[in-house]
Amino acid sequence: MMTGTIETTGNISAKKGGSVILQCHLSSTMAQVTQVNWEQHDHSLLAIRNAELGWHIYPAFKDRVAPGPGLGLTLQSLTMNDTGEYFCTYHTYPDGTYRGRIFLEVLESSVAEHSARFQIPIEGRDYKDDDDKHHHHHH
């Protein structure tokens, strides 16, 4: 039975030319995370984090996607075209597949600065200290 839930950074906005961290976290399950896939709104893959083999950044994003922190992804040099949905897919054993959604809005610099104070911080989890040991890797 799949008991886990995916927490994500939800709806986020970031400044054009800046960077943003996309984070998902799987909780409420003891399942082992074997792989996390990061996909863009058009279903193109950005990156893979395999528990055994490490990271693979897809070539189309190699110059502006950085792995981490933890199982998250840092998207750099943002353009307006980066606006849209992003998905994290957690492949786990024995549970199966969990999927989380993040919506990123890339704003023109002046707009981003103006709207920053209206953003609601995510409650609960502190993503700054995320690393693999927080993601239920039981060996």
Partner: antibody
């Protein structure tokens, strides 16, 4: 130690079929994207096609000259990659290698010795 | 269909630097890989993801990839480096090899 051993090659008539196998060991096969590459006698390397890991959909991609005639599959429980070749042509004559796609720093293993497929009447 | 172009042959003196180029449309948007093949042997991966070296490959092998050109550089070329070298454009939907370059160490 990463090892790939191809088998199943041989002499076949034009229009015939053949199934190649590649036995993998020394790594977690199910995580790897696997390709078939061929080399005609005295010629260069030519990519045939690939199959992604199940965790990336298990989908296949093929080079134009073999699309619709060749089928790549995998059996993760047996750590084995397959290449089913139908409607073979004389220009398919080559040594066929199975290879690990270089996705991960921790998985860039050597190629196998290859298996020779000869298509001739 | 996507094509990669390599020079058929490159010559270098022992101890000198050899550069082998590979050109293709927007090759820099893909990953460039390089394989070495000696007569009668299976190919060996010497560079992957543009500039990474697999374990066991000497430091004298390096790679770069930007724009429309990927380059394999062999510093302090040795006689044992004489071989055919193939570039490869790798992305998540397709793979293409160049025609190969014969490196001769004079």
């Amino acid at each position: 130690e990463v090892q790939l051993v191809e088998s199943g090659g041989g002499l076949v008539k034009p229009g015939g079929s053949l199934r190649l196998s590649c036995a993998a060991s020394g790594f977690t096969f199910s995580y790897a994207w696997m390709s078939w590459v061929r080399q005609a006698p005295g010629k260069g390397l030519e990519w045939v096609g690939r199959i992604k890991s199940k965790t990336n959909g298990g989908t296949t991609d093929y080079a134009a000259p073999v699309k619709g005639r060749f089928t790549i599959s995998r059996d993760d429980s047996k750590d084995t990659l397959y290449l089913l070749m139908n409607s073979l042509k004389t220009e398919d004559t080559a040594v066929y290698y199975c290879t690990i796609d270089p996705l991960y720093d921790l998985l860039t293993g050597p190629w196998g010795q290859g298996t020779l497929v000869t298509v001739s009447s | 269909s996507y094509e990669l172009t390599q020079p058929p042959s490159v010559s270098v003196s022992p101890g000198q630097t050899a550069s082998i180029t590979c050109s293709g449309d927007k090759l820099g948007d893909k990953y460039g890989c390089w394989y070495q093949q000696k007569p009668g042997q299976s190919p060996i991966l010497v560079i992957y993801q543009d500039s990474k070296r697999p374990s066991g490959i000497p430091e004298r092998f390096s790679g770069s990839n930007s724009g429309n050109t990927a380059t394999l550089t062999i510093s302090g070329t040795q006689a044992m480096d004489e071989a055919d070298y193939y570039c490869q454009a790798w992305d998540s939907s397709t793979v293409v090899f160049g025609g190969g370059t014969k490196l001769t160490v004079l």
